[in-house]
């Protein structure tokens, strides 16, 4: 149970992180291109890894045209990082009623990342409550 | 059917600044972002930059930063570059091209403008 | 930037021909190349995307190929109205670039 619980901390700092980097993304909002991203909301239930997934394939880019170039694209690669999986993530992988990627709505940048930040929010908070009722499975 | 319509030919003077229109029919305008192209002598073609319709955002190649400004009319579904400082290095014929988007990706430019001819002469 | 390098900058060639255009990256662009047609008078026209799909209404005879830095285009059995200019692009990084172009003529 011991690394099974580390595994879950470890998904639970990446997650964190995550949502450190999309914040800091946002202040450079004006230097990414605008262009339209697939921007999952209001993703059903047991779909968020799916949802999590198109957001780590959206072509988001750096206009390269500023003194933040570096920053924003060695965020722009931390934010592609594989989380550390976990069992209800392993389960979710295997469903395939779950919307595709072109399908969601298409947002730019600064709407895409408030998404993106709003999905990390939901499945930290689903974690900690399947944690709390002693299954991993929400 | 898609088209985007261009203003026409400018003959210009050194130091002037100028605007050309890109009006769109035919599709969704604040779906697609729309880019500027620059063609040099008919040949070399340069990316200029972009404009999202949908908010107004732009961005740049770092070698027409301050030289062109991209805008927009959603009312009249037309986008506009201004070019500024204008140099004889600046006669070219400029194009608008619409954005191809495929699935989630997007992937070149689909829809191009007939150009407008730029000549920048005293 | 990314430099496009395409060759040749000339071909000339024959109706029922198949001809190759060729475009090297600086570096690594992954799949994301564009090809274009453009002829006077007429609006560019966009051929293929994203390495080797093929734009909806292009003819089948256009097809690309290649990943990361080495592209081909290749038009088999050329047509007359094929003889025209063309370009590749990168859609991988920002600033966008072109290739210097290639004008197929008739031989």
């Known amino acids: 149970h011991k690394s099974s619980s580390q595994g879950q901390d470890r998904h639970m700092i990446r997650m964190r992180q995550l949502i450190d980097i999309v914040d800091q993304l946002k202040n450079y909002v004006n230097d990414l291109v605008p262009e339209f991203l697939p921007a999952p909301e209001d993703v059903e239930t047991n779909c968020e890894w799916s949802a999590f997934s198109c957001f780590q394939k959206a072509q988001l880019k750096s206009a390269n045209t500023g003194n933040n170039e570096r920053i924003i694209n060695v965020s722009i690669k931390k934010l592609k990082r594989k989380p550390p999986s976990t069992n209800a993530g392993r389960r979710q992988k295997h469903r395939l009623t779950c919307p595709s990627c072109d399908s969601y709505e298409k947002k730019p940048p600064k709407e895409f990342l408030e998404r993106f930040k709003s999905l990390l929010q939901k499945m930290i908070h689903q974690h900690l409550s399947s944690r709390t009722h002693g299954s991993e499975d929400s | 059917q898609v088209q985007l319509q261009q203003s026409g030919p400018e003959l210009v003077k050194p130091g002037a600044s100028m605007k050309i229109s890109c009006k769109a029919s035919?599709?969704?305008?604040?779906?697609?972002?729309m880019n500027w192209v620059k063609q040099s002598h008919g040949k070399n073609l340069e990316w200029i930059g972009l404009?999202?319709?949908?908010?107004?955002?732009?961005a740049y190649s770092p070698k027409f930063k301050g030289k062109a400004t991209l805008t927009v009319d959603k009312s009249s579904s037309t986008v506009y570059m201004e070019l500024l400082s204008l140099t004889s290095e600046d006669s070219a014929v400029y194009h608008c091209?619409?954005?191809?988007?495929?699935?989630?990706?997007?992937?070149?430019?689909?829809?191009w403008g007939q150009g407008t001819s730029v000549t920048v002469s005293s | 930037d990314i430099q496009m390098n395409q060759s040749p900058s000339y071909l000339a060639a024959s109706p029922g021909e198949t001809i190759t255009i060729n475009c090297r990256a600086s570096?690594?662009?992954?799949?994301?190349i564009a090809w274009y047609q453009e002829k006077p008078g007429k609006t560019n026209k966009l051929l293929i995307y994203?390495?080797?799909t093929l734009q909806s209404g292009i003819p089948s005879r256009f097809s690309g190929s290649g990943s990361g830095t080495d592209f081909t285009l290749t038009i088999s059995s050329l047509e007359p109205e094929d003889f025209a200019m063309y370009y590749c692009?990168?859609?991988?990084?920002?600033?966008?670039?072109f290739g210097a172009g290639t004008k197929l003529e008739l031989k």
């Open positions: 035919g599709y969704d305008f604040t779906g697609y972002t």
């Open positions: 404009i999202n319709p949908y908010n107004g955002g732009t």
């Open positions: 692009q990168q859609h991988e990084e920002y600033p966008l670039t």
């Open positions: 994203a390495g080797g």
């Open positions: 091209a619409r954005t191809h988007y495929y699935g989630s990706e997007y992937t070149g430019m689909d829809y």
């Open positions: 570096k690594s662009i992954e799949k994301y």
